[in-house]
Amino acid sequence: LPAQVAFTPYAPEPGGTCRLREYYDQTAQMCCSKCPPGQHAKVFCTKTSDTVCDSCEDSTYTQLWNWVPECLSCGSRCSSDQVETQACTREQNRICTCRPGWYCALSKQEGCRLCAQLRKCRPGFGVARPGTETSDVVCKPCAPGTFSNTTSSTDICRPHQICHVVAIPGNASMDAVCTSTSPTRSMAPGAVHLPQPVSTRSQHTQPTPAPSTAPGTSFLLPVGPSPPAEGSTGD
C-alpha cells in the first residue's frame, strides 16, 4: 500500500520534520502551510485548520515562503543620487543603486544605503584605480614624463609629447610645448593606459557623502527552532 499523503495541519513523526513550504507551529504542535511570496499569515493554524494567507498591502512585501503576520515595509523612495533598479512589489523590496558618477559608500542587503560622489583627480594627478559601484577612485601623482591637466574621475596620466625643440618643458600638470611642428608621443614610465571605469560615470568633485533617504528594510533573521521564515529559509 502507498504511504498516505498527510494534509496540513498534521502532527509530524517523532523526530521528523515538516515538508517543503511548511513550518512546525509550536503552539498547535502541527506542521502547517507557509504562505507564498507576496502574502502573509492572516490566521495562524490550529490543530484542525490550516494557515490562512492574505496578500501584502501596498508598499509591503514578502520575498520568501513565510508565516509572518505582517509583510515587510518596502524601503522609502530612492534619493536624488540614486536610481531605482527594482521597484517595490508585493514580492520584492525596492532596490536603489547609485547613479553614474557616484559609488556606494554604505551598502545594505540589497542595493545601497549611502551614495557618494566619485573622487576627481586634480591636475598633476591621474586615476590609479578607477571607481566601481562600491569603491572610490584612487588618484596618484603623475610620474616624471607624464601629466594630467584635468580635474577628472576618469583621466589617467598621459605621456608628455617629445619635442625636437622644447619651448616649455612639461611637468606633472602640463604637457610639454614644442617649437617644432611634428612632436611625437613617448611611452614614458608610468604611462600605462588604464581601462575606463566599470560603468560610465560623469566627472565630479571630491567625495561628498550624500545621505540616502532609503533606509533598508532589514530582514530580521530569527534564530531558534522555528523562525517565521521571511528572510530565513527559502523554498
Epitope: 503552539t27 490566521v43 490550529t46 517565521p228
Partner: antibody, heavy 119, light 106 residues
Framework: QVTLKESGPTLVKPTQTLTLTCTFS??????????VGWIRQPPGKALEWLAH???????YYNPALKSRLTITKDTSKNQVVLTMTNMDPVDTATYYC???????????WGQGTTVTVSS | DIQMTQSPSSLSASVGDRVTITCKAS??????IAWYQHKPGKVPKLLIH???TLQPGVPSRFSGSGSGSDYTLTISSLQPEDVATYYC????????FGGGTKVEIK
C-alpha cells in the same frame, strides 16, 4: 463595537468548581480566525493566561492548570464557558475574558469579574 | 513553557522622561510579543503587537523593539496619563505574561 463581559459567582468555597461565562458581542466565534481566552490576576500579582478556544473548537490550556480547566463555546449564544475544579484560596483573582485575533494576541478585554475562594 | 522576565518591576520618572521597560523570554519568540497598559480599575489595553506594531489610537510616544528573546517597550516622553502597570505577553508558544512594571510619576 466589540464588547465582552464575564459573569459567575463572586464567592466560591475551597474544593468547589468555578464556572465562569463570557458573553460577547461585535464578533462571532463562527468567524474564521476568531478566538476567546481567559486570563486571571490575583491581588497584587501579574496576569496569568488560563485557556483559549478558537472558532474551529481547537482548545489550549495553561500546562500548569490543564488538569483543572475546561473551556467550551456556544456559538449561537455568543458565549464561552470556563470551568475550574478544586478551587483553592490561591485561585482568588480577577478573571478576564478577552478576544484573540487570528495571529494570536488578545486585542479586546472584558471588564473582569472578581472571584474570592474562602470557606 | 516559556518564561517572561520583565524589568524593572517598578519605576518612578518625571514627566517628559524617556522610559524603557524590557522583557526577556526564556527562548526565542520570533517577535511574537504584545504590550498592554493596565490602569487600576480599568481593562488592560493593547498598545503594541508583533514587537513594534502600534495599535490604532495609541499615542506615538509608545514604541516597541526587539528580536530573538529580548524586547523593549519605550515611552519617549512620559505623560501623567501613562501612570499604569505595563505587561508584556509572548505568544510565540502558547501565552505567557511578564511580571509587570508599575510606572509612577516623581
Amino acid at each position: 463595537q466589540v464588547t465582552l463581559k464575564e459573569s459567575g459567582p463572586t464567592l466560591v468555597k475551597p474544593t468547589q468548581t468555578l464556572t465562569l461565562t463570557c458573553t460577547f458581542s461585535g464578533f462571532s466565534l463562527s468567524t474564521l480566525g476568531m478566538g476567546v481566552g481567559w486570563i486571571r490576576q490575583p491581588p497584587g500579582k501579574a496576569l496569568e493566561w488560563l485557556a483559549h478556544i478558537w472558532w474551529d473548537a481547537d482548545k489550549y490550556y495553561n500546562p500548569a492548570l490543564k488538569s483543572r480547566l475546561t473551556i467550551t463555546k456556544d456559538t449561537s449564544k455568543n458565549q464561552v464557558v470556563l470551568t475550574m475544579t478544586n478551587m483553592d484560596p490561591v485561585d482568588t483573582a480577577t478573571y478576564y475574558c478577552a478576544r484573540m485575533t487570528g495571529t494570536r494576541y488578545f486585542d479586546v478585554w472584558g471588564q473582569g469579574t472578581t472571584v474570592t475562594v474562602s470557606s | 513553557d516559556i518564561q517572561m522576565t520583565q524589568s524593572p518591576s517598578s519605576l518612578s520618572a518625571s514627566v517628559g522622561d524617556r522610559v524603557t521597560i524590557t522583557c526577556k523570554a526564556s527562548q526565542n519568540i520570533n517577535k511574537f510579543i504584545a504590550w498592554y497598559q493596565h490602569k487600576p480599575g480599568k481593562v488592560p489595553k493593547l498598545l503594541i503587537h508583533y514587537t513594534s506594531t502600534l495599535q490604532p489610537g495609541v499615542p506615538s510616544r509608545f514604541s516597541g523593539s526587539g528580536s530573538g528573546s529580548d524586547y523593549t517597550l519605550t515611552i519617549s516622553s512620559l505623560q501623567p496619563e501613562d501612570v499604569a502597570t505595563y505587561y508584556c505577553l509572548q505568544y510565540g508558544v502558547l501565552w505567557t505574561f511578564g511580571g509587570g512594571t508599575k510606572v509612577e510619576i516623581k
